[in-house]
């Protein structure tokens, strides 16, 4: 069967720094060398690119220095943390895969992780 | 706008070579897999070759690998056909298409017309 | 390769019927589009990942299925609907379509 099956867990909440972590894993059905995992943000029916790298297997997942994301590769399993997020990121985060070389090309989406950001509370001011 | 403008097809003798182009504009050119499809006159159409993101990875349909080379220039915003040794089989319209982000074709171009005969 | 074969070749009905079109793959597909296209123009998007419509593409489009069989349906025709549709599978190289199914009026 030709298909890459690609998991991420349904919901994560972030942080009260606004940093949110999860895990998307893929059934690879090729041995690639090169692989390229997009995280996409969908609200509505709009479709976004939020961050994605390239990395060689076996290498560490590079991210560009101005991205939100960063993460770590094991095997087929990548782990994704999106800092910086507000309340009004909230939304379905998508993890996309690509085995990008050698051919064939395969392509596998997972169904979104739902991110909830809860801006924190400001800090009262104290009277001394 | 969103769109795709080719350009470069014509008339060309078997053996010959053409190259296409296609310009993008209206979206990050450089975060989008290109593709060229053709489709023969009063036939279906038939996927040619896909250029991902910088440019590095290709891929193509058989009866074109080693004839036909795709390329990018993502500062230009534009992608190319390299057609060589072209044959009659390769007569067809030729359109570029954006692969969206979930994979399908979403943007296509107006599509344009290369006629290989002697 | 997987191959797509589409079904019927060529559909005749009226304008407010109802329309049924069949892919169906040489093996399972994870991802699963329709276009549409008239004479003379390019290609459209209409469904992705076999059930999804595109962005502007009307209700009355609708597709579903999974694995090897997939039906795209529109629930009632409009004149402006009668063209040629290709079903595509895009989840490995090479990308491939099916013939086309021609919905013509009767």
């Known amino acids: 069967c030709k298909a890459m099956h690609v998991a991420q867990p349904a919901v994560v909440l972030a942080s009260s720094r606004g940093i949110a972590s999860f895990v998307c894993e893929y059934a690879s059905p090729g041995k690639a060398t090169e692989v390229r995992v997009t995280v996409l943000r969908q609200a509505d029916s709009q479709v976004t690119e939020v961050c994605a790298a390239t990395y060689m297997m076996g290498n560490e997942l590079t991210f560009l220095d101005d991205s939100i994301c960063t993460g770590t590769s094991s095997g087929n399993q990548v782990n994704l943390t999106i800092q910086g997020l507000r309340a009004m990121d909230t939304g379905l985060y998508i993890c996309k895969v690509e085995l990008m070389y050698p051919p064939p090309y395969y392509l596998g989406i997972g169904n979104g992780t739902q991110i909830y950001v809860i801006d924190p509370e400001p800090c009262p001011d104290s009277d001394f | 706008q969103v769109q795709l403008v080719e350009s470069g097809g014509g008339v060309v003798q078997p053996g010959r070579s053409l190259r296409l182009s296609c310009e993008a504009s209206?979206?990050?050119?450089?975060?989008?897999?290109m593709n060229w499809v053709r489709q023969a006159p009063g036939k279906g159409l038939e996927w040619v070759a896909v250029?991902?993101?910088?440019?590095?990875?290709?891929h193509y349909t058989d009866s074109v690998k080693g004839r036909f080379t795709i390329s990018r220039d993502n500062s230009k915003n534009t992608l190319y056909l390299q057609m060589n040794s072209l044959r009659a089989e390769d007569t067809a319209v030729y359109y570029c298409?954006?692969?969206?982000?979930?994979?399908?074709?979403?943007?296509w171009g107006q599509g344009t017309m290369v006629t290989v005969s002697s | 390769e997987i191959v797509l074969t589409q079904s019927p070749g060529t559909l005749s009905l009226s304008p407010g019927e109802r329309a049924t079109l069949s892919c169906r793959a040489s093996?399972?597909?994870?991802?699963l589009a329709w276009y549409q296209q008239k004479p003379g123009q390019a290609p459209r998007l209409l469904i992705y990942?076999?059930?999804s419509r595109a962005t502007g593409i009307p209700d009355r489009f609708s597709g579903s299925g999974s694995g090897t069989d997939f039906t795209l349906t529109i629930s009632r025709l409009e004149p402006e609907d009668f063209a040629v549709y290709y079903c595509?599978?895009?989840?490995?190289?090479?990308?491939?379509f099916g013939q086309g199914t021609k919905v013509e009026i009767k």
């Open positions: 595509q599978q895009y989840g490995s190289s090479p990308w491939t």
């Open positions: 298409a954006r692969a969206h982000y979930f994979g399908a074709f979403d943007i």
């Open positions: 250029i991902w993101y910088d440019g590095r990875n290709k």
């Open positions: 209206g979206f990050t050119f450089s975060s989008y897999g």
């Open positions: 990942g076999a059930s």
């Open positions: 093996q399972s597909v994870s991802y």
